[in-house]
Amino acid sequence: HNTTVFQGVAGQSLQVSCPYDSMKHWGRRKAWCRQLGEKGPCQRVVSTHNLWLLSFLRRWNGSTAITDDTLGGTLTITLRNLQPHDAGLYQCQSLHGSEADTLRKVLVEVLADPLDHRDAGDLWFPGESESFEDAHVEHSISRSLLEGEIPFPPTS
């Protein structure tokens, strides 16, 4: 899977979209999870309604919401009041029983609010020298990773 980068401004909302084949994933609930480390598990953040036909209803977990257009085949995740700690690698998933298929890998980048003059030193997003594999850019603001870019900040 390519990784798609979505950029949002700190303090604002970011909307992430994950398109999928609505017939292939018919009847399946969806989920949004956060990747814990490059090889680690993907920790569930929020999932769509337990009743598939009600997947269009927005479900929240904290500041993260999920809604699914099951006919059009678009899963939408909203990250409200984006914070620096929200930056990182996520996945949109299609659930089949206790298993999950990855619909899209997403890198969330948090940009400093240009109107906020506080120290932005704790904001992280990959610099030009850091790189990722299989990149592809979409703007919402979003983009795909450039070849060789890495989705995680270097650890000290």
Partner: antibody, heavy 125, light 107 residues
């Protein structure tokens, strides 16, 4: 009419290769999961695997992984099951089936609602 | 893999009898279960999907119930054409798995 038509009976020798087919008509073949099921003589049904012709996504039962290859040609609405080296124990009836889509309550479900007539494969020296 | 255990493996009954076949999953499968009927020399036929919903065209004497791990197929009044082998199939997780079958014979 919605149907799946399978290729005819096959008689093969051990070690030979084989590819059997399952052609769909009367429905949008590329938007349905297609499954393969084995039934050995006098025995029950065994789920082999499934393919989504739209993007060639395949899931195998661990019992059949590496033993058979499932594929599809969406341009001709046909799914395939193949062996590179047959064994006598592959002697069986093989069925393909469509996973139909159903709504029940507020849930979405699948059921193998349309079946091929079956292909008999006999492997004997 | 999820194991599906069907019981009984065979059953003798008479026309007009009420018959119950059970299927137990080795782990909870919600209601992602179907029941299939197979007659000798024929392909299987879907009777029940989603554990309890009757497939179009299937006589109402067939019914299904259950959720989680325990499921039942009931034929309220056996007809001559019902003597066949019945299978459950879970499609909750890959690989999907069949029960071993219940052969329903004429007493």
């Amino acid at each position: 009419e919605v149907q799946l038509v399978q290729s005819g009976a096959e008689v093969k020798k051990p070690g030979e290769s084989l590819k059997i087919s399952c052609k769909g008509s009367g429905f949008s073949f590329n938007t349905y999961w297609i499954g393969w099921v084995r039934q050995m003589p006098g025995k029950g049904l065994e789920w082999m695997g499934i393919i989504y012709p739209g993007d060639q996504d395949i899931r195998y039962s661990p019992s059949f992984q590496g033993q058979v290859t499932i594929s599809a040609d969406k341009s001709i609405s046909t799914a395939y099951l193949q062996w590179s080296s047959l064994k006598a124990s592959d002697t069986a009836m093989y069925y393909c089936a469509r996973y139909g889509r159903y709504i029940y309550g507020y849930g979405g479900y699948h059921g193998m609602d349309v079946w091929g007539q079956g292909t008999t494969v006999t492997v004997s020296s | 893999d999820i194991q599906m255990t069907q019981s009984p493996s065979s059953l003798s009954a008479s026309v007009g009898d009420r018959v119950t076949i059970t299927c137990r999953a080795s782990q909870a499968i919600r209601d992602d279960l179907g029941w299939y009927q197979q007659k000798p020399g024929k392909a299987p036929k879907l009777l029940i999907y989603a554990a309890s919903s009757l497939q179009s065209g299937v006589p109402s004497r067939f019914s299904g119930s259950g959720s989680g791990t325990d499921f039942t197929l009931t034929i309220s009044s056996l007809q001559p054409e019902d003597f066949a082998t019945y299978y459950c199939l879970q499609n909750y997780n890959y690989p999907h798995t069949f029960g071993q079958g219940t052969k329903l014979e004429i007493k």
